[in-house]
């Protein structure tokens, strides 16, 4: 039961995380205008991975896409790539993990197969979360670097008279969404990996079964049980015995009351 709960929770946490990564990637507020030097600006600038926006005094917001690919900073391209890789891996992970859920029955899929799929999706979630965290962190680092560079060059003009205040950018909401979402995806992935260990069929200590054959007594001990870890062979676990000895039931799976679709 604990395994099912861990797996289900891991799936839900990862699902929320990936939704957050998608939201962060699409958001326009990766960097927002720093209002420290002009808290009463009527023109507010903010930028995303795909477009930059300006909110004017009228309340109207104008956004313009980055229509160039080659003209964009390499760092921005790298962040885009990391976020997209994170989304793709996360989406595949979600797809795999749906079929891996213990509470969902698909034909005669064995626990070893589900364990394999759970581990695969868990690893995908972990990598997805790391990609998102890395992408957001690279962007944040870029912002910090640019912030201090623009602070150093901020005041231009002659004779010390301030004429132009260079627009500085600080962390936008998308960065925080991305960090949290990446963290959730990572946690979900770890939970899936933990659940995978519980799903993998382990060696069961079967009690000795004794019965009377014609004329003599033989005690059978379960020495011939072939255990599968769930990571290698996908063959059906068999108990090797002679004659018609009654054996313990195979490891039972406990279907949940609810199927998660």
């Amino acid at each position: 039961m604990a395994v099912t709960a861990c797996q289900g929770l891991g799936f839900v946490v990862s699902l929320i995380g990936i939704a957050g990564i998608i939201a962060a990637t699409c958001m326009d507020q990766w960097s927002t205008q720093d209002l420290y030097n002009n808290p009463v600006t009527a023109v507010f600038n903010y930028q995303g991975l795909w477009r930059s926006c300006v909110r004017e005094s009228s309340g109207f917001t104008e956004c313009r896409g980055y229509f160039t690919l080659l003209g964009l900073p390499a760092m921005l391209q790298a962040v885009r790539a990391l976020m997209i890789v994170g989304i793709v891996l996360g989406a595949i992970g979600l797809l795999v993990s749906i079929f891996a859920l213990k509470c969902i029955r698909i034909g005669s899929m064995e626990d070893s197969a589900k364990a394999n799929m759970t581990l695969t999706s868990g690893i995908m979630f972990i990598v997805s979360g790391l990609c998102a965290i890395a992408g957001v962190s690279v962007f944040a680092n870029m912002l910090v670097t640019n912030f201090w560079m623009s602070t150093a060059n901020m005041y231009t003009g002659m004779g010390g008279m301030v004429q132009t205040v260079q627009t500085r950018y600080t962390f936008g909401a998308a960065l925080f969404v991305g960090w949290v979402a990446g963290g959730l995806t990572l946690i979900g992935g770890v939970m899936m990996c933990i659940a995978c260990r519980g799903l993998a069929p382990e060696e069961t200590n079967y009690k000795a079964v004794s019965y009377h054959a014609s004329g003599h007594s033989v005690a059978y001990k379960p020495g011939g049980f072939k255990a599968s870890t769930g990571f290698g062979s996908n063959t059906k676990n068999k108990k090797i015995y002679d004659g018609g000895a009654r054996t313990e039931d195979e490891v039972q799976s406990y279907p949940s009351k609810h199927d998660y679709v």
């Epitope: 205008q33 600006t41 023109v43 300006v54 004017e56 005094s57 205040v165």
Partner: antibody
Framework: QVQLVQSGAEVKKPGASVKMSCKAS????????MHWVRQAPGQRLEWIGY????????SYNQKFKGKATLTVDTSASTAYMELSSLRSEDTAVYYC????????WGQGTTVTVSS | DIQMTQSPSSLSASVGDRVTMTCKSS????????????LTWYQQKPGKAPKLLIY???TRESGVPSRFSGSGSGTDFTLTISSLQPEDFATYYC?????????FGGGTKLEIK
């Protein structure tokens, strides 16, 4: 077409209050902030403040804080400005202004403060 | 607050003349986010509400005749009327649309010579 129709002229005594309205039509009222500007006789135009019809958020010129109160009734597509503790210096034409680039102005409400 | 200074305060000209008026701001009105200067020009006739002529320092509002043109960047701006028409005699105001409080210039009154 986009139009702002303001309430009629008001004559008030010093210390009194006045509430004027600005009815918007021809556009989605919540799309743009509603700004208020005044013009005293022979003076330059002065920005009073604005209200965001979406959330009722306001921003005021420091000079008019405590003097002007901006409100909206989105269901009626109408913005209001109330001026309190009127003095003779508040005698002016008050305009509501909206849309992008602050392109559309009301016809103005003349407020005369006289004892 | 950003101070807006217009010059001259009044100007006499004849129909057909080319007229130029200037507006200076105490701080730059240039927004690096979209590379625009947030300066607006209005025309006001007696007893009427101001009418938008130019926004972003040089972009003409739709319906405004092409004889009106705006130029300038940062802190120095100019409004030019290439060939004065009788209906152009009015007061012209520049406005800072970049920083709150939004501020207006004192106006340039264009009179018939």
């Amino acid at each position: 077409q986009v139009q702002l129709v303001q309430s009629g002229a008001e004559v008030k005594k010093p210390g009194a209050s006045v509430k004027m309205s600005c009815k918007a039509s021809g556009y989605t009222f919540t799309d743009y902030n509603m700004h208020w500007v005044r013009q005293a006789p022979g003076q330059r135009l002065e920005w009073i403040g604005y209200i965001n019809p979406n959330n009722g958020g306001t921003s005021y010129n420091q000079k008019f804080k405590g003097k002007a109160t901006l409100t909206v009734d989105t269901s009626a597509s109408t913005a209001y400005m109330e001026l309190s503790s009127l003095r003779s210096e508040d005698t002016a034409v008050y305009y509501c202004v909206t849309t992008r680039y602050l392109a559309v102005w009301g016809q103005g409400t003349t407020v005369t403060v006289s004892s | 607050d950003i101070q807006m200074t217009q010059s001259p305060s009044s100007l006499s000209a004849s129909v057909g003349d080319r007229v130029t008026m200037t507006c200076k701001s105490s701080q730059s009105l240039f927004n690096s986010g979209n590379q625009k200067n947030y300066l607006t020009w209005y025309q006001q006739k007696p007893g009427k509400a101001p009418k938008l002529l130019i926004y972003w320092a040089s972009t003409r509002e739709s319906g405004v005749p092409s004889r009106f043109s705006g130029s300038g960047s940062g802190t120095d701006f100019t409004l030019t009327i290439s060939s004065l028409q009788p209906e152009d005699f009015a007061t012209y105001y520049c406005q800072n649309d970049y920083s709150y409080p939004l501020t207006f210039g004192g106006g340039t009154k264009l009179e018939i010579k």
